[in-house]
């Protein structure tokens, strides 16, 4: 048996992937266990192995198909169940009536690249990952750059209200190392949150031309 | 603005058909789920059946195998074909679409349309 608290949080990434985290207190030493899918309406259920991401959190990602394809809507309602093995048995340990659109986060944006780069200034762009084509171009962004010498969470956040897929970094300085992230965010849901950060874009900015004022 | 338009309510006797029809029409939306819903006087709003997109069907209880659900999510059109009317089927019947308009999702309901089944 397993005491102590159980926290168990779920996301829909808007397409054909639900991500799950399961925490509890209790040991849990070598027990096998798994988060079940079963959709209210649908005639697929689905199921994952939940591997260790800390000593006492596991993790899982429900895979429903085709990357891009559209699995869940708005009156979907998913039973998801963590199941852990008790003997020959299974035992269940959480269980949430899921409501994918209310409980949205979205894949990190992806393919950021340098457009153009000066001595002060650099344009970069990316791409959003599997976003449902529910939202058109109604999602929010946001942006931070890492200076020399700061933290990412001293870096303000610049904020994008709009599916705009590119910003343009001023008042940079010249000839210096910079990294950059960007995350995504739809409008609807109640429990939807940020994506995760994307992978940070390391870009330089060009040397001020000698002799010239700058 | 979006609006929904019933049509196809009337009077028919036990163990008769009707088919309803509603379209979805107004400013740029997405649909995501459209379906029938009714109401009987002293009674709550009652699922009677939807549709969402990936061709999902549900149900209520009552109509299993007498009522059929038919979706066109191009032409944002959904009707219900009734069959094997019994008296309990008599109400108002209210078309729901699920809509989304700027990045969010509401729902949207018909006038109604009445349905009245006599023994």
């Known amino acids: 048996a397993v005491n102590g608290t159980s926290q168990f949080t779920c996301f829909y990434n808007s397409r054909a992937n639900i991500s799950c985290v399961w925490s509890q207190d209790g040991a849990l030493q070598d027990t096998s266990c798994q988060v079940h899918a079963w959709p209210d309406r649908r005639r697929w259920n689905q199921t994952c192995e939940l591997l260790p991401v800390s000593q006492a959190s596991w993790a899982c990602n429900l895979i429903l198909g085709a990357p891009d394809s559209q699995k869940l809507t708005t009156v979907d309602i998913v039973t998801l169940r963590v199941l852990c093995r008790e003997g020959v048995r299974w035992r269940v340990m959480a269980i949430q009536d899921f409501k994918p659109f209310e409980n949205l986060r979205l894949m990190a944006p992806i393919s950021l690249q340098v457009v153009h780069v000066e001595t002060h200034r650099c344009n970069i762009s990316w791409e959003i990952s599997q976003a449902s084509h529910y939202f058109e171009r109604h999602l929010e962004f946001e942006a931070r750059t890492l200076s020399p010498g700061h933290t990412w969470e001293e870096a303000p956040l610049l904020t994008l209200k709009q599916k705009q897929e590119w910003i343009c970094l001023e008042t940079l300085t010249p000839d210096t190392q910079y990294e950059f992230q960007v995350r995504v965010k739809p409008l609807q849901g109640e429990f939807t949150t940020w994506s995760p950060w994307s992978q940070p874009l390391a870009f330089r900015t060009k040397p001020a031309a000698l002799g010239k004022d700058t | 603005e979006v609006q929904l338009v019933e049509s196809g309510g009337g009077s028919v006797q036990t163990g008769g058909s009707l088919r309803l029809s509603c379209v979805v029409s107004?400013?740029?939306?997405?649909?995501?789920?459209m379906g029938w819903y009714r109401q009987v006087p002293g009674k709550q709003r009652e699922l009677v059946a939807d549709?969402?997109?990936?061709?999902?069907?549900k149900y209520g209880d009552s109509v299993k195998g007498r009522f059929t659900i038919l979706r066109d999510s191009v032409k944002n059109t959904v009707t219900l074909q009734m069959s094997s009317l019994n008296p309990e089927d008599t109400g108002v019947y209210y078309c729901?679409?699920?809509?989304?308009?700027?990045?969010?999702?509401?729902?949207?309901w018909g006038q109604g349309t009445q349905v009245t089944v006599t023994s």
């Open positions: 729901k679409a699920g809509l989304w308009i700027t990045g969010r999702h509401s729902d949207y």
């Open positions: 107004g400013s740029h939306f997405i649909s995501d789920v």
């Open positions: 549709m969402a997109d990936g061709g999902s069907a």
